[in-house]
Interface confidence: medium
């Protein structure tokens, strides 16, 4: 049979290297030789390229080499397939060389901020050494911050006569390190070069861009003064590398601005001892380039009633995240402060906090929380300068099986009954929320029985036992990840009871 007609002819001019055409050869049953017929020099010249490979995948491509490739030029390319039964020709295809030229990537040699120009970096590069002298080049510049994975792109063109191979990338974050890569193409071409090697550059530093401020209210002391722990951090979206030399804090009673106290610190928290009335606290951060905008927070009076609006709250784990959701009865509340810290018996030292706006849920990556640790999570509604009553729950980012089972005791042994009691597993050993307990018991040489009770129950009465019989009993505490047995206890039922 005649060979299949070559289809899907595609040509690329790897600039000043070769012109390679490829095609779909079809299902060949016998050896087929392909000849690529070309007219070039605007139809004035013609020549052939013949595949000489015996493997079918290499036979579906052929290359023409310098110096018989010029740009600009128009080519016709036709592929002939020949086997023992005859010759078949492809459709004639037409190519403008400048439309299919592909160059090497440019080389970025410098990425630098421009003195005195904020939020900008200048990229300097060398054009690919092999690039058409007669064509303009178009470029795509892609960039991302060092700790991001998603690229942003900007497209621009450069005139071939333009000696200035630079581009000013604007609208960036201050004092942030960026990763830059560049690719180019002949302006008329559909083929882009590969991406250049990546190069890093940093924007200029600015004054700090702002702070987020929070507080932890503690019970009033004997003298009526109340300790308030002030906490702050860089505003969301602030540059990761933003430097701060220190903080100015000032506070005053709501009723009297004349009683303003000021303080300086380089720490990221501060303990204030305030009177019982309401106060305003303000602060700024500063560095060698200036001050941040002011952050302000109202501290309510001790006797002030805070509003309540969260009706229900739950936590669940979904796709490597801990998700906390709540329902609110107040439609006008759209900002919430989330606090979370490990539930340990000692005073919490590592309180974390974050605000949420325009949503009634909060998510945190599982790996930002310790696995098998119980966290106390509180959500505070915020309305203007007022902070509402928090709703708190406990949650685990990742649950495991308890590291030990419940400590178990046997009480009130009777002829046919017994009470099994157990203690809660210490917090540090639970590794998850205990959802139930299972009591396993078995008469010596007899069949085993089990009974499951919910986690609020710490004792259980076994009935219908055999008199004067040895039993073994064990209690298992379970989390969603599985259960762990406590130590097994032996007991023997009585032979008779005083009540018999």
């Amino acid at each position: 049979a005649l060979p299949a007609k070559p289809e899907n002819i595609s040509c690329v001019y790897y600039y000043r290297k070769n012109l390679t055409c490829t095609w779909s050869p079809g299902k060949e049953t016998s050896y087929t030789q392909y000849t690529v017929k070309r007219t070039y020099a605007f139809g004035e010249k013609h020549d052939n390229c013949t595949t000489n490979s015996s493997t079918s995948e290499n036979r579906a491509s052929c290359s023409f080499f310098l110096p018989r490739i010029t740009i600009p030029d128009n080519y016709t390319i036709e592929v002939e397939a020949e086997n023992g039964d005859g010759v078949i020709k492809s459709h004639m295809t037409y190519w403008r060389l400048e439309n299919i030229a592909k160059t090497e990537p440019p080389k970025i040699f410098r990425v630098k901020p421009v003195l005195g120009i904020k939020r900008m970096i200048q990229i300097e590069w060398i054009k690919p050494e092999l690039a058409p002298v007669s064509s303009d080049l178009k470029y795509t510049l892609r960039f991302r911050t060092v700790n991001s994975t998603s690229w942003m792109e900007v497209n621009f063109a450069k005139n071939r006569k333009d000696k200035n191979q630079t581009y000013n990338l604007t609208g960036l974050q201050p004092f942030t390190e960026y990763v830059i890569a560049l690719r180019c193409a002949v302006k008329e071409s559909k083929f882009w070069s590969d991406w250049s090697q990546e190069k890093m550059g940093m924007t200029e530093e600015e004054a700090p861009c702002g702070l987020e401020l929070w507080r932890v209210l503690k019970p009033a002391e004997a003298d009526g003064r109340r300790p308030v722990r002030l906490l702050w951090k860089k505003a969301r979206g602030a540059p990761v590398l933003e430097k701060t030399l220190g903080y100015n804090i000032w506070y005053y009673p709501e009723s009297n601005t004349n009683l303003t106290e000021t303080m300086n610190t380089t720490n990221q928290q501060l303990e204030l001892h305030l009177g019982g009335e309401s106060f305003w606290v303000s602060m700024i951060s500063y560095n060698s380039l200036g001050k941040s905008p002011v952050a302000t927070l109202r501290i309510p009076a001790i006797q002030e009633k805070s509003f309540q609006c969260i009706e229900v709250m739950q936590a669940c784990v979904a796709e490597d995240q801990l998700v906390v959701k709540w329902q609110s009865s107040a439609l006008d509340v759209n900002t919430w402060m989330i606090e979370w810290f490990p539930d340990v018996d000692s005073e919490p030292t590592t309180l974390s906090w974050e605000s949420v706006s325009q949503a009634t849920n909060w998510t945190i990556q599982q790996d930002k929380l310790k696995p098998f640790w119980c966290y106390n999570i509180s959500v505070y509604p915020m309305l203007h300068d007022k902070v509402g009553e928090p709703y708190s729950i406990q949650a685990y980012a990742k649950e495991g099986v308890p590291s030990e089972g419940p400590e178990t005791k046997v009480e009130n042994i009777g002829v046919k009954t017994v009470t099994i009691t157990w203690k809660e597993i210490p917090k540090s050993e639970r590794k998850g929320i205990i959802c139930n307990y299972t009591i396993f018991y078995q008469a010596e040489g007899g069949k085993g029985f089990s009974k499951t009770v919910n986690s609020s129950i710490l004792q259980y009465g076994l009935e219908s036992l055999k008199r004067k019989t040895s039993y073994i009993v064990q209690v298992m505490a379970s989390t969603s990840a599985g259960g762990t047995n406590g130590t097994s206890i032996n007991f023997k039922t009585l032979s008779f009871s005083v009540f018999e």
Epitope: R16, K17, N18, F65, L66, P67, T70, D73, L130, S134
Partner: antibody, heavy 121, light 107 residues
Amino acid sequence: QVQLVQSGAEVKKPGASVKVSCKASGYTFTGYAMNWVRQAPGQGLEWMGLINPYNGGTDYNPQFQGRVTITADKSTSTAYMELSSLRSEDTAVYYCARDGYDDGPYTLETWGQGTLVTVSS
Amino acid sequence: DIQMTQSPSSLSASVGDRVTITCQASEDIYSFVAWYQQKPGKAPKLLIYNAQTEAQGVPSRFSGSGSGTDFTLTISSLQPEDFATYYCQHHYDSPLTFGGGTKVEIK
């Protein structure tokens, strides 16, 4: 800037071979064909052949076929022209010349300084 | 092979003269012709390619024209540094061939 630097003058006996080198700099060596042209004393220019350093492909003037071998070493950006079975009429200045513009192949845009080869018994 | 016949083989002219050199190809070579200038003891220098395109850095007094088989190099106003030998060359295909050269001398 583009530069082609050739090896020094040679004196050879008839029947011997000569190998002239041409070191390229200031451009991508594999991106341009390298030609060899000779000029006998007081005579015109005669094209001998070329090499494409990218793939080693050569193209020779049939007048020299079998006697001339053009090679290229990509690692050192150097082209070589070897002429064997020398005779007295091969006495000439031998030039390497880089292929020229995008839209004019076979134009000899940049030339080496030339190497005088004298064939004499 | 394509033969390139150049004329005249030599000419004498004065500074400021308009000089014309012609070259005839043995077959139709469209516009694939280049012109070179060579001074004694030096390598040739490319002036014109594709019959009429000036090479980089070549003074505008040099111009080329023609297509098919007949080609011309014109120096509009001869300068002292233009006294040299000029060669035409076809760049249609291999093998490349040159004209015999035209020596431009001071009158």
